[in-house]
């Protein structure tokens, strides 16, 4: 699971980023006139995203294969990674331009500056991830993905600064999951809830994924999780890989990970 020469193995696309999100009509894809697309966004407390806002979202992983209205009657869609079925093999905003016929039917790209943002793709050497709204309690029905992608050869040192999630025996309600990979399928490290600070974690490669999920009821204080890039070191001084399972109700852990 490395990132080399600008290519990474697995693609995780964000459904919402930098305040931008995609909307379609209840009746399905490509059913909204320009006026209706504006209305959809405004009913939710936002407005149609500008081209710049859509591009800013795309740069942190917002990828949708559906053309939608933007501000000023523009239509397009954001492509992070080119594919055969979407985007004509290009990346960037696939721009259909400003439409003369505002009765054409497309989807909508909304921007809501008040939305509690979470997740994204991170390439900085260090960063702190916070649950949405921290230090206030997080909200119900949140799903956030943080994808860390550092330089090839670097590893990721993850440490928990604050941690308070709804406590339940299997961490089935609210939880943070850590994956030693660029997706939430491979390299499962552990699932965490409760209010005990989990131990530090070191990745085996240059990528890592954090997933935060909260259910439809009961919230808590939230979390702050910090990561720092670790430059390549000789094999003799690398952290020891261990495999641990904890069945306590504070943290539910399974899988392989590097413990400090």
């Amino acid at each position: 699971w490395g990132f080399k020469d600008g290519i990474f193995h697995n693609s995780i696309w964000l459904e919402r980023a930098a305040g931008v999100y995609h909307r379609e009509a209840r009746s399905g894809k490509y059913k909204l006139t320009y006026a209706e697309a504006k209305a959809v966004c405004e009913f939710e407390g936002g407005h149609l995203a500008t081209y710049k806002q859509l591009e800013a979202a795309r740069k942190i992983g917002f990828h949708v294969c559906a053309a939608g209205w933007m501000a000023k009657g523009r239509v397009g869609y954001p492509i992070v990674k080119p594919g055969p079925n979407c985007g004509f093999g290009k990346t960037g905003i696939i721009d259909y331009g400003i439409r003369l016929n505002r009765s054409e039917r497309w989807d909508a790209y909304c921007y809501n500056p008040h939305a509690k943002e979470c997740g994204g793709v991170f390439t900085d050497p260090k960063q702190i991830f916070k649950s949405p709204g921290f230090p206030n309690e997080y909200e119900d029905n949140q799903i956030c993905y943080w994808h860390i992608r550092l330089k090839y050869g670097q590893r990721i040192h993850l440490s928990f600064l604050d941690f308070d999630l709804e406590d339940d025996p299997g961490c089935l309600a609210d939880y943070v999951e850590i994956y030693d990979s660029y997706d939430d399928v491979h390299g499962f490290v552990g699932r965490y809830c409760g209010d005990e600070l989990p131990d530090d974690i070191i990745s085996t490669g240059n990528v890592m994924t954090l997933k935060f999920l909260s259910d439809a009821s009961v919230t808590a204080g939230g979390f702050q999780i910090k990561y720092v890039a670790m430059d390549p070191v000789s094999k003799s001084s690398q952290g020891k890989n261990t495999s641990t399972t904890s069945t306590g109700n504070k943290n539910f852990l399974a899988g392989r990970f590097s413990h400090l």
Epitope: A25, E36, E42, G45
Partner: antibody
Framework: QVQLQQSGAELAKPGASVRLSCQAS????????MHWVKQRPRQGLEWIGY????????KCHQKFKDKATLTADKSSSTAYMQLSSLTYEDSAVYYC?????????????WGQGTTLTVSS | ENVLTQSPAIMSASPGERVTMTCSAT?????MHWYQQKSSTSPKLWIY???KLASGVPGRFSGSGSGNSYSLTISSMEAEDVATYYC?????????FGAGTKLELK
């Protein structure tokens, strides 16, 4: 099944405030929007506004923006509407009604209504 | 504001008779929805997305229309259909209802 249980009838004096409640059950409260509708005796239906419980965002008809304040308590799956500076014209039946978040909107479930009587 | 005008305001029909009521909007909408309200009860969703019958609504009801003009039709009037029917648009702020068509039994 979906149920919206509204609070009982209210009698209030002009100038006072009241808070009406609407407790939802049978579905995930934060996955739908909650609207409020006014119906004066022998008259039609008038949309007041809505709250998106997941975010707390509210939007009211301009006519009611100084009259109605909408809130929601996710822990109890209850929506509230506070009506302030009551006048005789506020005497009506008030309904809460659920809509999906999908555009365009419609109300698929209604509460039984709360009768508000403003009288000195 | 998108004003919905229902006509007629009051109508009466004999059992078995075909009934049509209309709703016109000042601004075009993609869909119209209809509610039935019987005296001293909450409104009930009756027809949504112009032509889809809500759960439990008899098949003698139908809805049609587009743009600014919509209608609700009962193919064969029955006594239990006596009620007030409201059209409703959920496309534009503010959401609006028509003033209602009161259907009585002749």
């Amino acid at each position: 099944q979906v149920q919206l249980q509204q609070s009982g009838a209210e009698l209030a004096k002009p100038g006072a405030s009241v808070r009406l409640s609407c407790q939802a059950s049978g579905y995930t409260f934060t996955s739908y929007w909650m609207h409020w509708v006014k119906q004066r005796p022998r008259q039609g239906l008038e949309w007041i506004g809505y709250i998106i419980p997941s975010s707390g965002y509210t939007k009211c008809h301009q006519k009611f923006k100084d009259k109605a304040t909408l809130t929601a308590d996710k822990s109890s799956s209850t929506a509230y509407m506070q009506l302030s500076s009551l006048t005789y014209e506020d005497s009506a039946v008030y309904y809460c009604a659920r809509s999906t978040s999908g555009y365009p909107y419609y109300f698929d479930s209604w509460g039984q209504g709360t009768t508000l009587t403003v009288s000195s | 504001e998108n004003v919905l005008t229902q006509s007629p305001a009051i109508m009466s029909a004999s059992p078995g008779e075909r009934v049509t009521m209309t709703c016109s909007a000042t601004s075009s909408v993609s869909f119209m929805h209809w509610y039935q309200q019987k005296s001293s009860t909450s409104p009930k969703l009756w027809i949504y997305d112009t032509s889809k019958l809500a759960s439990g609504v008899p098949g003698r009801f139908s809805g049609s229309g587009s743009g600014n003009s919509y209608s609700l039709t009962i193919s064969s009037m029955e006594a239990e259909d006596v009620a007030t029917y409201y059209c409703f648009q959920g496309s534009w702020y503010p959401l609006t209802f028509g003033a209602g068509t009161k259907l009585e039994l002749k």
